[in-house]
Structures are given as structure tokens and as C-alpha cells.
Interface confidence: low
């Protein structure tokens, strides 16, 4: 068979643990555009939330902002909490890098983490009694 | 600056590009638990959304589910759209891995991608005319 050489621009796969271990460039490519969020949105959510800082130096990104619903009910047009409605968290699984072995500056392991991004409002379950 | 000695258990940082390039174990640590979402939630959101599949085989994760708000207004308790309220997207920046250089099997770069996770409801801006 013909040996197809790896492009000279590729790092050597001398790591005996390849494909389990790969090389990752931490210089982030930022293709995302900032979220457009008018500054007064947060005061106008019907299911508002606060953001809590979750910091872990053994993780990359080390800071994750976690949303926490401010109320169990939802805020109506008059600004009052309506307990007939419910504020519920919206969660998403994200990818982070965890230092492994711990405290090593150059060695990480992929980890999936569930984070709460915000809250939304749901109407209650209505059970019709026949 | 003081050079902080690496723990003896850490892999050698022979990569001349350290700290930009690090070694990553792809065996995912999955500490997260699946989001608990009762099956009937989606029918009860006041700002419902649909999920669109965003697929890119050159990225990890290759499939990202993007939320798209179903209405411009919000759904009231009677199940009708209320145009005095607005459904707005909740966005989050996530990390993905992209092959770089493109043709290398063992070399990746972190990339930030903005995704829409769900939608929430906001009350309109009320301008008081004096």
C-alpha cells in the first residue's frame, strides 16, 4: 500500500495515546457575534433571573455564569408575580476542558457540563375533571 | 518572572507553542445529568420555540440544536398570541473544537459560537409621555 504522508503542517502524532490525546490551540477563534440584548431586557422578563458566577480554576473556561430564576411564578404586565404561571430554567450542555492531572498547566480532558442559561415562563398543567 | 515547577505527574511541555497549545484527552468526562424537562413543557411555554439542526462535520460537536422563537408575541393563558408581549431569544456563547490545520487529524482549535438556547417573554417598553 502507498503511505500517504501527513501534511508537513500537521503536528507529529508521536503521542502514543493518539487518537485519545490530541493537541488543542487555546487561542480562541471567535466567530460569534455578541448577543444583542437591550440593556433594559432584564427588567422586562416575565421570568427574570439572576446570574451567579461559577468559578473553577481547574476548568477552562474557568468562569461560567449560571442563571437562577428569581421567582417561582412569572411577572405579569402589572409587574406583579402571578403564581398561576411558573418560571422554569432553560438548560444546555456545554463543552469545557478540565485540567487532568489536576494543576497541570498543559494537560486537559474534555468534559460536558449542564448549565442554566436563563428562565422562561410556562402555563400550569390544567386537569379537566369530567 | 518566577518559573513555577510543573508537578512531576504532568506531561512534558515539549510543544514549543505551550501555553498556546495544550494536550487534551478526548475521553469525555460526563458529569452532567440530562436536563429534566417534562415532555409537556414545550406545549406550555408562553414563548415557545422550535429546534433547528445546525450540522457541521468539521466541528465538534458536529450537531448543534438552535432554537427559533415560534412567535413574535407571547402565548397567554388562553393559548392566544398576545402582541403586547414579545418572545425574545436567549443566547449563549459555547466552546466547540475545530480542526486546525483543517486536514490534520490530531490538531484542533477552540472556537466560540453563539447559539440560541430557547426563548423567553418580555413586557413591552412603556414610554410615559409627560
Amino acid at each position: 500500500g502507498i503511505m500517504i504522508p501527513q501534511s508537513p503542517g500537521c503536528p507529529k502524532t508521536e503521542d502514543k495515546n493518539f487518537p485519545q490525546h490530541v493537541r488543542v490551540n487555546l487561542n480562541i477563534l471567535n466567530r460569534s457575534t455578541p448577543a444583542r440584548r437591550p440593556s433594559d431586557y432584564s427588567k422586562r422578563f416575565t421570568s427574570p433571573w439572576t446570574l451567579q458566577r461559577n468559578e473553577d480554576p481547574e476548568r477552562y473556561s474557568s468562569v461560567i455564569w449560571e442563571a437562577k430564576c428569581s421567582h417561582s411564578g412569572c411577572i405579569n404586565a402589572e409587574g406583579k408575580e402571578d403564581h398561576h404561571m411558573n418560571s422554569v430554567p432553560i438548560q444546555q450542555e456545554i463543552l469545557v476542558l478540565r485540567r487532568e492531572p489536576r494543576h497541570c498547566p498543559n494537560s486537559f480532558r474534555l468534559e460536558k457540563v449542564m448549565v442554566t442559561v436563563g428562565c422562561t415562563c410556562v402555563t400550569p398543567i390544567v386537569r379537566h375533571i369530567s | 518572572g518566577i518559573m513555577i515547577p510543573q508537578s512531576p505527574g504532568c506531561p512534558k511541555t515539549e510543544d514549543k507553542n505551550f501555553p498556546q497549545h495544550v494536550r487534551v484527552n478526548l475521553n469525555i468526562l460526563n458529569r452532567s445529568t440530562p436536563a429534566r424537562r417534562p415532555s409537556d413543557y414545550s406545549k406550555r411555554f408562553t414563548s415557545p420555540w422550535t429546534l433547528q439542526r445546525n450540522e457541521d462535520p468539521e466541528r465538534y460537536s458536529s450537531v448543534i440544536w438552535e432554537a427559533k422563537c415560534s412567535h413574535s408575541g407571547c402565548i397567554n393563558a388562553e393559548g392566544k398570541e398576545d402582541h403586547h408581549m414579545n418572545s425574545v431569544p436567549i443566547q449563549q456563547e459555547i466552546l466547540v473544537l475545530r480542526r486546525e490545520p483543517r486536514h490534520c487529524p490530531n490538531s484542533f482549535r477552540l472556537e466560540k459560537v453563539m447559539v440560541t438556547v430557547g426563548c423567553t417573554c418580555v413586557t413591552p417598553i412603556v414610554r410615559h409621555i409627560s
Epitope: - | Y60, S62, N106
Partner: nanobody, 119 residues
Framework: EVQLVESGGGLVQPGGSLRLSCAAS????????MYWVRQAPGKGLEWVAE????????YYVDSVKGRFTISRDNAKNSLYLQMNSLRAEDTAVYYC????????????WGQGTLVTVSS
């Protein structure tokens, strides 16, 4: 429904050759990198080779470089592995896999085909 069906395995003497085939269906074959993965008796899974969507680029684990060749025919939705100069340590069940760009992540694979290298 995604289906991957391997064939072509068998018993071969050291130094011999085999050609494995994989018939794919249920997805857009030409949009995905494809892989061969193997599992030797009593061992874990080992990534063997990968071929990019258009067949222009191939990668191999060091132990098979120069002996194995991965190829594909997008018109036939088929993946191949030409195995030459076979050694006893190549004895394994070989799986064809569709996957993510990360070399460990395969979302689908076939039932496998057994390759035994023995005199």
C-alpha cells in the same frame, strides 16, 4: 435509519492481504469523514484509519502506516480498507464507523468483520 455493513474479513497468513468493504445507507455518505476502528481479542477499541468526505485526505494510526490504505466510493456509498503485509497483531474485529471529527467519537458503526492473521 443509519446502517453500516462490513464484509471481507477472514483467515489469512502473515504477510497476506485482505480487502474490507463497508456498505453505508441511511445518511448522506459524502458529507462525512469515515473511519475504520478495530478491537483485538481482550483489548479496547483502536482507531485505525480515517478518510475525509471527498476522499482527498487519509490518516492512519502509526502501526498500520504504509501497510493499510483506506478509500471510498461516494457514488456507491462504500468504504474500503486494503490491508497488506498483515501481521498477527492485526487480528481483530474491524468496524466501519461514521463519526465526529474527533477521532474518538463515532455516532454509528457496523456489526464488524473478523480478521484473523495466523499461520
Amino acid at each position: 435509519e443509519v446502517q453500516l455493513v462490513e464484509s471481507g474479513g477472514g483467515l489469512v497468513q502473515p504477510g497476506g492481504s485482505l480487502r474490507l468493504s463497508c456498505a453505508a445507507s441511511g445518511f448522506t455518505f459524502s458529507s462525512y469523514s469515515m473511519y475504520w476502528v478495530r478491537q483485538a481479542p481482550g483489548k479496547g477499541l483502536e482507531w485505525v484509519a480515517e478518510i475525509k468526505q471527498d476522499g482527498s485526505e487519509q490518516y492512519y494510526v502509526d502501526s498500520v502506516k504504509g501497510r493499510f490504505t483506506i478509500s471510498r466510493d461516494n457514488a456507491k456509498n462504500s468504504l474500503y480498507l486494503q490491508m497488506n503485509s498483515l501481521r498477527a497483531e492485526d487480528t481483530a474485529v474491524y468496524y466501519c464507523a461514521k463519526g465526529e471529527i474527533l477521532p474518538l467519537y463515532f455516532d454509528y458503526w457496523g456489526q464488524g468483520t473478523l480478521v484473523t492473521v495466523s499461520s
